[in-house]
């Protein structure tokens, strides 16, 4: 609601203003009436029976101050010209409102020519004889405005040209947009502008402990001519550690926090935090609990997980399958990952070292989310120790580690991988491979073969190489072939038994 700043109030002045009348005593004059034991003053004129009336009433000089546009509210009565028999020719039912600006008070020096007409003031309702005699006068209210004003002060004047008028109230005021708190911004009392289409842009200031959010617009409002605030732009938000309570920002209570400038209220400190002081932007973690850099302040403090609960290592030739179960204590987090490390030890010397370079994992061994992994390319007759470490988002904040280990001894080489390189009606050319780390342990390879379906006899060939040609074979016959590595410590794991067929005589040309 616009604020009105009153510059002149005749009704409130109790007849003390002493306005100038011209001609003196013959036209407008001050009158007093008593209503409810209170004096009511009015300026009245009623020379309706005489023609050529030109009676002026001029206010005292009114200091303009900061006003740009003034509003003039008049309360008055006008009597019906028909109340005056024979006066209809000269009687009027309107009067004229004028103003004049000046930088000084002219006192009793009244000059009509200095005045500019604002408007002819006509009543909405006239007071007829019967109403007048019954004391039921019809009060009219009219408002006009003038602006922009530029001089130090001004006068208003009322010209009577033969009406029967009583002027009960003259109130002159200007409008201000009142001091305002909106969107946690304070807008100062602002003088309304003088031009109807224009809106004065007013910058607001954030209330104590409020800020313009990053990337947000500075608070602004527009003060309209009628003293109303319009078109709010931007806003302020309570800063970290403060929340909105009505039109102010209040510090978070102890045990509560707010970590950023936002519209949200203060939140209760989460689990595993220490009680916060007043105005906290975060809640510190209890001893042994931590917050990862990316953790929101609203999240409970957490700790590293315990070790994987149960770890098994199952050897399969030169492979080991590691399986484990999640930690019993996740530390309050869901971002658990596992890392697998490998150590190998030579039984003869007891010497140990890392074996990451020589083994192969079924998937990268760091940042594992599954609870199993297969390790292959293990060397025979070697002792392996596998460590599975559980980590979460706060593990990096502590020096201790949460891990479980499992050891396994590899007694055999990995089975060779066998391929048929070529064949004829009487021969089969076979090759094989084993992982390079294991090759140094191999003394010879033993190739066993026999006809399919003949379980009574078999042939053995030994070689140091990685291939052999088996000849003197029967045509168009299926042979079962198996390759096994021989090491100083004994036999390694045999390959799968492969079925290879020699060519038939009629297909030998192929």
């Amino acid at each position: 609601q616009g604020k009105e700043v009153v510059l002149l109030d005749f009704a409130a002045a109790g007849g003390e203003l002493g306005w100038l009348t011209h001609p003196y005593g013959k036209g407008w004059d001050l009158m007093q009436n008593i209503m409810n034991d209170m004096p009511i003053y009015m300026y009245s004129v009623c020379n309706v029976m005489s023609g050529d009336q030109d009676n002026w009433l001029r206010t005292n000089w009114v200091y303009r101050g900061e006003a740009e546009r003034i509003f003039i509210e008049l309360k008055f009565t006008v009597r019906d010209c028909n109340s005056f028999p024979g006066g209809a020719s000269s009687c009027k039912e309107t009067f004229n409102l004028y103003y004049a600006e000046s930088d000084l008070d002219y006192g009793t020096n009244f000059q009509k020519r200095l005045f500019t007409k604002i408007d002819t003031i006509a009543p909405d309702e006239i007071t007829v004889s019967s109403d007048f005699e019954a004391r039921h006068v019809k009060l009219n209210v009219e408002e006009r405005s003038v602006g922009p004003l530029t001089r130090k002060g001004f006068y208003l004047a009322f010209q009577d040209i033969g009406a029967c008028v009583a002027l009960l109230s003259v109130r002159v005021y200007y409008k201000k947009c009142p001091e305002l708190l909106q969107g946690l911004a304070h807008f100062p009392e602002t003088i309304a502008g003088s031009d109807a289409p224009s809106l004065a842009t007013v910058a607001g200031t954030c209330v104590d402990h409020a800020v313009v959010p990053p990337g947000g617009e500075e608070p602004r409002m527009h003060c309209a001519v009628d003293g109303e605030w319009l078109v709010p732009i931007g806003q302020c938000l309570c800063q970290a550690g403060y929340e909105k309570v009505e039109d102010a920002c209040q510090a978070c209570s102890p045990g509560f926090f707010k970590f950023e400038a936002s519209e949200s209220p203060c939140l209760e400190c989460p689990e595993h935090t220490l009680p916060s002081p007043e105005g906290a932007t975060s809640c510190e973690c209890e001893e042994g609990f931590f917050r990862a850099p990316q953790d929101p302040a609203s999240m409970p403090c957490t700790r590293p997980p315990s070790a994987p609960h149960y770890l098994t290592a199952v050897g399969m030739g030169a492979k080991v399958e590691l399986r484990w179960t999640p930690p019993q204590d996740s530390g309050g987090r869901e971002d658990i990952v596992y890392s697998v490390t490998c150590e190998q030890c030579w039984p003869e010397s007891g010497e140990c070292g890392p074996c990451e370079a020589s083994v192969r994992y079924s998937e990268p061994p760091h940042g594992l989310t599954r609870t199993s992994v297969t390790v292959s390319d293990l060397e025979p007759h070697m002792n392996y120790t596998f460590t599975v470490e559980a980590r979460n988002g706060v593990s990096g904040l502590v020096t201790s580690r949460s891990f479980r280990t499992a050891s396994v001894s590899i007694n055999q080489t990995e089975p060779p991988k066998v391929r048929l390189e070529g064949r004829s009606t009487t021969s089969l050319s076979v090759s094989w491979s084993i992982p390079p780390p294991q090759q140094s342990r191999v003394w010879k390879y033993e190739v066993t073969y026999r006809k399919k379906g003949d379980s009574n006899s078999y042939n053995v060939r030994r070689t140091e190489g990685f291939s052999v040609t088996l000849d003197d074979l029967a045509p168009d016959t299926t042979y079962l072939v198996q390759v096994q590595a021989l090491t100083q410590e004994g036999q390694g794991a045999g390959s799968k038994v492969h079925e290879f067929q020699t060519l038939s005589p009629e297909g030998s040309g192929n």
Partner: antibody, heavy 120, light 110 residues
Framework: QVQLVQSGGGLVQPGGSLRLSCAAS????????MHWVRQAPGKCLEWVTV????????YYADSVKGRFTISRDNSKNTLYLQMNSLRAEDTAVYYC?????????????WGQGTLVTVSS | SSELTQPPSVSVAPGQTVTITCQGD??????ASWYQQKPGTAPKLLIY???NRPSGVPDRFSGSSSGTSASLTITGAQAEDEADYYC????????????FGCGTKLTVLG
């Protein structure tokens, strides 16, 4: 106590002059319009003249216009009526009176009256 | 015209009600004021405006107006009310500033 005390009346020959005074007390004299009203022996009250609170404006009844002059000295709280070219028909008791509001009254405070007799 | 006309005299028995009238064109435009004058003294304001009494004036005195007529009514007249009564009004004709009636002599019988 609000009062108006008059002085200066008496017997004067036709064509002569006389000055009446009216001393005010008990109120802010400079805030009120002041009037002179007369009453011929056994006759009606007759309004004579008015002066505005600041003394800048005066108005006279046609019967005395050009012969009588109303004035005031607000510093002395005193109202005056200078009567020149007096006539027999000016014989009357002269009252000063205060207009309670505005220029035309009503007249709420009256002086005690002073008799002016114009006779040869 | 700018004249106010009053009856020269009226009489009333003590305790009775009496009305003094005042006629004039100005009374259409302006309210009358009423004054009481006792012999050898200055007039005293009784009624002004619609029907306003200055402090100290008994409430048995009242005023009213209608058209070109104004009235002063004394309800329950008393012996001390015997006096001359004058009506007065602003002049709407522009001839005079203010006009008085010629007064009404009130006699309280008994």
């Amino acid at each position: 106590q609000v009062q108006l005390v008059q002085s200066g009346g008496g017997l004067v020959q036709p064509g002569g002059s006389l000055r009446l005074s009216c001393a005010a007390s008990g109120f802010t004299f400079s805030s009120y319009a002041m009037h002179w009203v007369r009453q011929a022996p056994g006759k009606c009250l007759e309004w004579v003249t008015v002066i505005s609170p600041d003394g800048h404006n005066t108005y006279y009844a046609d019967s005395v216009k050009g012969r009588f002059t109303i004035s005031r000295d607000n510093s002395k709280n005193t109202l005056y009526l200078q009567m020149n070219s007096l006539r027999a028909e000016d014989t009357a008791v002269y009252y000063c009176a205060r207009a309670s509001v505005g220029a035309t009254g009503p007249f709420d405070i009256w002086g005690q009256g002073t008799l002016v007799t114009v006779s040869s | 015209s700018s004249e106010l006309t009053q009856p020269p005299s009226v009489s009333v028995a003590p305790g009775q009600t009496v009305t003094i009238t005042c006629q004039g064109d100005s009374l259409r435009s302006y309210y009358a004021s009423w004054y009481q004058q006792k012999p050898g003294t200055a007039p005293k304001l009784l009624i002004y405006g619609e029907n306003n009494r200055p402090s100290g004036v008994p409430d048995r005195f009242s005023g009213s107006s209608s058209g070109t007529s104004a009235s002063l009514t004394i309800t329950g007249a008393q012996a001390e009310d015997e006096a001359d009564y004058y009506c007065n009004s602003r002049d709407s004709s522009g001839t005079h500033l203010t006009v008085f009636g010629c007064g009404t002599k009130l006699t309280v019988l008994g």
